[in-house]
């Protein structure tokens, strides 16, 4: 019985699940395919975070291809999420900051953060892994940035956000990679690990864009995505070199990925995701 085939997953602070685009294919590069037609199509550009036009050859390619700008926006952006939610001049919090914390109807044990309107602070809670509501953040910093007031009573300065398709939580875009860095490597380095659909258990590595490291995962032997490497070295070669550090005068310098300490230390517990 395949009930017994499920693996226990342990996630610790060194291996957080990658943050997701609304759909992982939104991170794929525009692919015109091998054919020679000239067809106007649209794709989502993860660097500009906008839907853009490209010429499609008429066959093959990938799922990051849409007939219309509207369809692309619908699949890869969310108007209610991609807008800048607030600036230091706006005191309103999004409505979902006032929702009660909701663990959802499932029972994985995942540490998340919610804004407690009684204490006016972001606090930790155990999320079950499905459903719940939008007052649900992967990090304390995200929660603070979106829902807490700054020291002068204004909102914390913020940036564009993206709806996490998983649990409808708003995920600031700049948490996809640390804010000190821009990513200029292959787009698939930002996609989550994908086991694929088969039954094998092959040792592979994927690039975890949240922590900036290559991590092992079990590949099923078919399907999945391109964030899949047979060795850690191959993974690092392909993905780690894509990070470029910004320096204050706007210039860009190549860097080995040393991370500035985050403003907020995120105290992740070991999370046992029960039979997920």
């Amino acid at each position: 019985d395949s009930e017994e085939d499920e693996e226990h997953t342990i996630i610790t602070d060194t291996e957080l699940p990658p943050l997701k685009l609304m759909h992982s294919f939104c991170a794929f590069k525009a692919d015109d395919g091998p054919c020679k037609a000239i067809m106007k199509r649209f794709f989502f550009n993860i660097f500009t975070r906008q839907c853009e036009e490209f010429i499609y050859g008429g066959c093959e390619g990938n799922q990051n291809r849409f007939e219309s700008l509207e369809e692309c926006k619908k699949m890869c952006t969310r108007d209610n999420a991609n807008r800048i939610i607030k600036t230091t001049l706006q005191q309103e919090k999004p409505d979902f900051c006032f929702l009660e914390e909701d663990p959802g109807i499932c029972r994985g044990y995942i540490t998340r953060y919610f804004y407690n309107n009684q204490t006016k602070q972001c606090e930790r809670f155990k999320y079950g892994g499905c459903l719940g509501n939008m007052n649900n953040f992967e990090t304390l910093e995200e929660c603070k940035n979106i829902c807490e007031d700054g020291p002068n009573g204004f909102q914390v300065d913020n940036y564009g956000t993206q709806l996490n398709a998983v649990n409808n939580s708003l995920t600031p875009q700049s948490t996809k990679v640390p804010s000190l860095f821009e990513f200029h490597g292959p787009s698939w380095c930002l996609t989550p690990a994908d086991r694929g659909l088969c039954r094998a258990n092959e040792n592979r590595f994927y690039y975890n864009s949240v922590i900036g490291k290559c991590r092992p995962f079990k590949y099923s032997g078919c399907g999945g995505n391109e964030n899949n490497f047979t060795s850690k070295q191959e993974c690092l070669r392909a993905c780690k070199k894509g990070f470029i550090q910004r320096i204050s005068k706007g210039g860009l310098i190549k860097t080995k990925r040393k991370r500035k300490k985050q403003r907020v230390k995120i105290a992740y517990e070991e999370i046992f995701v029960k039979n997920m």
Partner: antibody
Framework: QVQLQQSGPGLVKPSQTLSLTCAIS??????????WSWIRQSPGRGLEWLGI?????????QYAVSVKSRITINPDTSKNQFSLQLNSVTPEDTAVYYC?????????????WGQGTLVTVSS | DIVMTQSPLSLPVTPGEPASISCRSS???????????LNWYLQKPGQSPQLLIY???NRASGVPDRFSGSGSGTDFTLKISRVEAEDVGVYYC?????????FGQGTKVEIK
């Protein structure tokens, strides 16, 4: 073995309140590894989820927007059951109503269902 | 709401032959941990629905291994490797990625 036993009238007049009860055996309505739901089925609308309640650190509920203004699902811990109340019913609410258990721990699905109650809304 | 679309709506089958049902969701049902927020149910004639497959591909307790679920993103498939007479009924897919929980319109499997 979890069993869900439904009870309640099969005929309700328009504008009145539909009330059904689901008695649980083999599990507890207060279990933190389950959630308790009502789902209805009609030829026109297929299977339609109405709402769910669950106990974790406290009681939570979620309702379908289509019935949110009219629905209440309540637990009764003393009798180990939960109930559905749907106010201001119309003939559109005629359906087979099922209570179901959502397995929260491993299966993440409706793994036990009541026998179903055909409720007809008619004067 | 997430719309679940099943095809075909009716599937005449021959005992011993394979059968396949498709379910498409209007948005992706895959979580970061690789969990697929999709279940399959079978409602036999005159009975309540029963859980067949949970999290996209895991058979529920007591479900024969001729049933298998697969798929990811927005496209999912339920396969029966060799149909038996007792497999007749209506098959439903159901998502729990977001509220409201929604079901497909059902695929009626009947013996030819």
């Amino acid at each position: 073995q979890v069993q869900l036993q439904q009870s309640g009238p099969g005929l309700v007049k328009p504008s009145q309140t539909l009330s059904l009860t689901c008695a649980i055996s083999g599990d507890s309505v207060s279990s933190n590894s389950a959630a308790w739901s009502w789902i209805r089925q009609s030829p026109g609308r297929g299977l339609e989820w109405l709402g769910i309640i669950y106990k974790r650190s406290k009681w939570y509920n979620q309702y379908a927007v289509s019935v949110k203004s009219r629905i209440t699902i309540n637990p009764d811990t003393s009798k180990n059951q939960f109930s559905l109340q749907l106010n201001s019913v119309t003939p559109e609410d005629t359906a087979v109503y099922y209570c179901a258990r959502w397995h929260s721990d491993k299966m993440w699905g409706f793994d036990d269902w009541g026998q179903g109650t055909l409720v007809t809304v008619s004067s | 709401d997430i719309v679940m679309t099943q095809s075909p709506l009716s599937l005449p089958v021959t005992p011993g032959e394979p059968a396949s049902i498709s379910c498409r969701s209007s948005q992706s049902l895959v979580f970061s941990f690789g969990i697929t927020y999709l279940n399959w149910y079978l409602q036999k004639p005159g009975q309540s629905p029963q859980l067949l497959i949970y999290k996209g591909s895991n058979r529920a307790s007591g479900v024969p291994d001729r049933f298998s679920g697969s798929g990811s993103g927005t496209d999912f498939t339920l396969k029966i490797s060799r149909v038996e007479a007792e497999d007749v009924g209506v098959y439903y897919c159901q998502q729990y990625d977001s509220y409201p929980l929604t079901f497909g319109q059902g695929t009626k499997v009947e013996i030819k």
